[in-house]
Interface confidence: medium
């Protein structure tokens, strides 16, 4: 179930997945929630003696059992990911951090009259992930009322330092507040030849688009279908970027599909989950568990309830079926996407719905009361 | 159009703008409405981009700069490029577009008459070419639809001007000996219309030329009268296919 409590002066030992810098524990929890494998986190609000660079460190962790040994550590805050917390799921982070310099690659500097205006500039700049604003009391006069737009390869600061009269915050694109616009076009038979930031295996261009939307540096994508001539690139989703923020003119290419990230959308922003079940398809990955259930929908439900499960394959092969149902293989990978997709008539595959805002249930959230 | 003037709204109601929506949206070619669901244009417009789903067709438009993302457009249901067309030659430069949904005819958007097969030898005297193309060889697309009157040039004479190319009987030429008025880049696929016996007919489809409006280098157009059978056959076979697939 959903575990939203935070543990003060507590640090989880072991299970390390990744370490990043975040300005507070809430932001660290958010980063853990949207990381494909993170289940637990520990955040250092104060720096250990002699290790000043560890302050603001957010340590993302995983565990087979769902828990890790706790050790006492002053100034540490630990907690769980909110992967199974339905309504609490949001990538939006509106907090402003006074006295902090969130460092990254400064790609734009301009004068603005307020922090709000600076945050708006960042929200409406395609490349901006976070920002730092120097107030009118900042010690260097030439930087006063300066708005620095920043980015990094992870989408989070490369370091965080306490500096008086600096204020930092994040882009509000994930809050659906960007005014950049929402290019929903999908180009059949076109490929973008721009810089690849990453690639993942996906069953279709729509999943590719959602992956792109939630990747910190993906602006557009090209997906190669199962008919693509190079076998190693079939069902591969290339996440792309460019200096200009726009793709170069697309190349005509049969069996390629291209489109844009929807991270600047206001209404059409997708959820970080994929509802569709793909019949005739098998998703390969690290095996977590196998159970026997009746139907692919039940298999998806099992995967969703198993916190570490990222995707599943349901097999209807005679040797995979028993009286209580057929084999439901729960799987995971380092990036949350299948390591390979194969086409098998007797299989159905899909994804966990653990990151869906509203996991469908018969209980209505809005009740209509009889008068 | 080089040496042309601004048109007024509804003056050439059959003229459409064929635009491509990729990273940005751009006018690529002209076309002519010949039926509620049919546009006639040049095959070479689709050379680089033969995928129907990226094309948008705007009718009843005078000023391209007034097109916004709210402006209604038609989409391509079927693209029929002449089977003998090769982009490495100028011949058979003709294509039919079947629209997803039929057009509503208005005073600003209605069809142009096709000539009959018997019109292959008709002598036309009042001919006009229209389009949003360049106004000079190294120019840019125009916002307001341009028009220019232009005399037809006999094929034998045209062939003499184009010694390096074959001017076939499926082509028709138009232009002034001294140059100065012609179709240009971006006018491709658009209409060359002539008023004959009181009504406008689609005589040519803008196809190619040596530069634009050069002296002794007339514009070359696809001669529509030579393709009447092909046009009618394609429209008919499309209707028959639609009947086969419609529910009983």
């Amino acid at each position: 179930g959903c575990l939203s409590q935070l543990y003060a002066n507590t640090f989880f030992r072991g299970g390390d997945l990744a370490a990043i810098y975040t300005p507070d524990a809430q932001h660290c929890q958010k980063m853990c929630t949207f990381h494909p494998r993170c289940l637990l986190f520990s955040f250092l609000a104060v720096s250990p003696t002699k290790e000043t660079d560890k302050r603001f460190g957010c340590f993302m962790k995983e565990s087979i059992t769902g828990t890790l040994p706790r050790i006492h550590r002053t100034g540490a805050i630990s907690g769980h990911s909110l992967k199974q917390c339905g309504h609490q799921l949001s990538a939006c982070h509106q907090d402003i951090y006074e006295g902090l310099d969130m460092r990254g690659s400064n790609f734009n500097i301009s004068k603005t009259d307020s922090i709000e205006e600076c945050q708006k500039l960042c929200t409406n700049n395609i490349h901006c992930q976070f920002f730092t604003y120097a107030t009118k009391a900042f010690h260097r006069p030439e930087y006063r009322k300066s708005c620095l737009l920043k980015r990094s390869s992870s989408g989070t600061p490369t370091s965080i330092k306490p500096v008086d009269n600096l204020v930092s915050g994040f882009s509000l694109k994930s809050c659906a507040l960007s005014e950049i616009g929402c290019p929903m076009d999908i180009f059949q038979h076109f490929a973008f030849a721009d810089l690849n930031v990453s690639h993942v295996v996906t069953p279709d261009a729509f999943v590719c688009r959602t992956v792109c939307t939630f990747h910190p540096n993906c602006l557009f994508f090209t997906f190669y279908t199962n008919e693509w001539e190079t076998e190693s690139q079939r069902n591969v989703c290339f996440l792309k970027t460019s200096k200009s923020g726009r793709p170069s003119p697309p190349i005509i290419q049969e069996n390629a599909v291209s489109g844009y990230s929807l991270f600047t959308c206001r209404k059409a922003r997708p959820e970080p989950c994929h509802f569709k079940i793909y019949s005739g398809v098998a998703f390969e990955g690290e095996e977590l568990n196998a159970t026997f259930v009746q139907g692919a929908d039940a298999c998806q439900e099992t995967c969703t309830k198993t916190i570490r499960c990222q995707f599943f394959t349901y097999s209807l092969l005679p040797q995979d079926c028993k009286a209580e149902g057929c084999k439901c293989s729960l799987r995971l990978s380092t990036d949350g996407s299948p390591t390979r997709i194969t086409y098998e008539a007797q299989g159905s595959s899909g994804y966990s719905l653990r990151l869906c805002k509203v996991v469908e249930s018969s209980d209505c959230t809005t009740k209509i009361n009889a008068r | 159009i080089v040496g042309g003037t601004n048109s007024s709204l509804g003056e050439w109601p059959w003229q459409v703008s064929l635009q491509v929506k990729l990273v940005s949206q751009n006018h690529m070619c002209g076309g002519s409405i010949i039926g509620r669901q049919w546009i006639l244009t040049a095959a070479h417009c689709f050379d680089g981009i033969p995928y129907p789903d990226v094309w948008r067709i705007y009718g009843g438009i005078l000023n391209l700069s007034e097109i916004t993302n709210k402006t209604p457009f038609s989409s391509i249901k079927e693209l029929i490029i002449h089977q003998k067309y090769k982009m490495s030659e100028g011949s058979y430069d003709i294509a039919l577009i079947k629209l997803q949904t039929p057009l509503n005819y208005t005073e600003f958007q209605k069809p142009i008459c096709l000539p009959s097969k018997a019109d292959t030898n008709t002598i036309y005297t009042n001919c006009w070419v229209t389009g949003w193309g360049y106004t000079k060889e190294r120019g840019e697309t125009q916002n307001i639809l341009q028009k220019a009157t232009i005399p037809l040039v006999p094929n034998e004479e045209c062939q003499k001007k184009y010694r390096d190319y074959v001017i076939t009987k499926q082509m028709i030429c138009a232009g002034y000996k001294e140059g100065g008025i012609d179709a240009c880049k971006g006018d491709s696929g658009g209409p060359l219309v002539c008023k004959h016996s009181g009504r406008w007919q689609l005589v040519g489809i803008t196809s190619w030329g040596e530069g634009c409006a050069r002296k002794e280098q007339p514009g070359v157009y696809t001669k529509v009268a030579e393709y009447i059978d092909w046009i009618l056959e394609k429209i008919q076979s499309s209707k028959e296919r639609a009947l086969e697939t419609s529910p009983a």
Epitope: - | G48, S88, G90, R163, K185, G186, S207, W208, G209
Partner: antibody, heavy 126, light 107 residues
Framework: EVQLLESGGGLVQPGGSLRLSCAAS????????MIWVRQAPGKGLEWVSY????????TYADSVKGRFTISRDNSKNTLYLQMNSLRAEDTAVYYC???????????????????WGQGTLVTVSS | DIQMTQSPSSLSAFVGDRVTITCRAS??????LNWYHQKPGKAPKLLIY???RLQSGVPSRLSGSGFGTDFTLTISSLQPEDFGNYYC?????????FGGGTKVEIR
Amino acid sequence: EVQLLESGGGLVQPGGSLRLSCAASGFTFSAYSMIWVRQAPGKGLEWVSYIRPSGGRTTYADSVKGRFTISRDNSKNTLYLQMNSLRAEDTAVYYCARGGLLLWNRELKSNYFDYWGQGTLVTVSS
Amino acid sequence: DIQMTQSPSSLSAFVGDRVTITCRASQPIDNYLNWYHQKPGKAPKLLIYAASRLQSGVPSRLSGSGFGTDFTLTISSLQPEDFGNYYCQQSYTVPYTFGGGTKVEIR
């Protein structure tokens, strides 16, 4: 099958002359523009000259203008390059190539070189 | 004259790698850009014309894009036979000019 075969290359002294020929087969020679391109040893490609199908229009690179003459004999399916006042910097492999016609956006251009001969070496040296 | 600048001047890649070569024109040339491949001691071979059109017989792992001044040749999955020199060439106006070439080696 389109074939282009150059001949006439060889060693020549500075100030001397050579005439290169290119025999064409497998296509209607009289319908295509033809091009000469050269490549100095270990260097890149350099366009030299171009002739229209009828032979009525020719163009040259500045480096050869006034010294080289391109011509064709459509009855013999042959392209020629007459090279006079040769210089050491004219040393190169000379290729003849066919110009492909491209119709795009109302422009019909001999726009790309779709078939090439195997080349003939011209060495200008004393 | 229009200058054509190719980059990189040489590259070394593994079989299966995605390779991108860029070509920049000193002034806009619409789509009048062609790509050729030349193996040592052989004549050049046309790969792509009009910026993005694949010459018949050329494998579809090769593709071209661009318009105006910036152009790209992409080999989606490098094969052993793809080694050699690649040249871009503009035919917007005479004199037709070539890029300096990109030497592609297989690691």
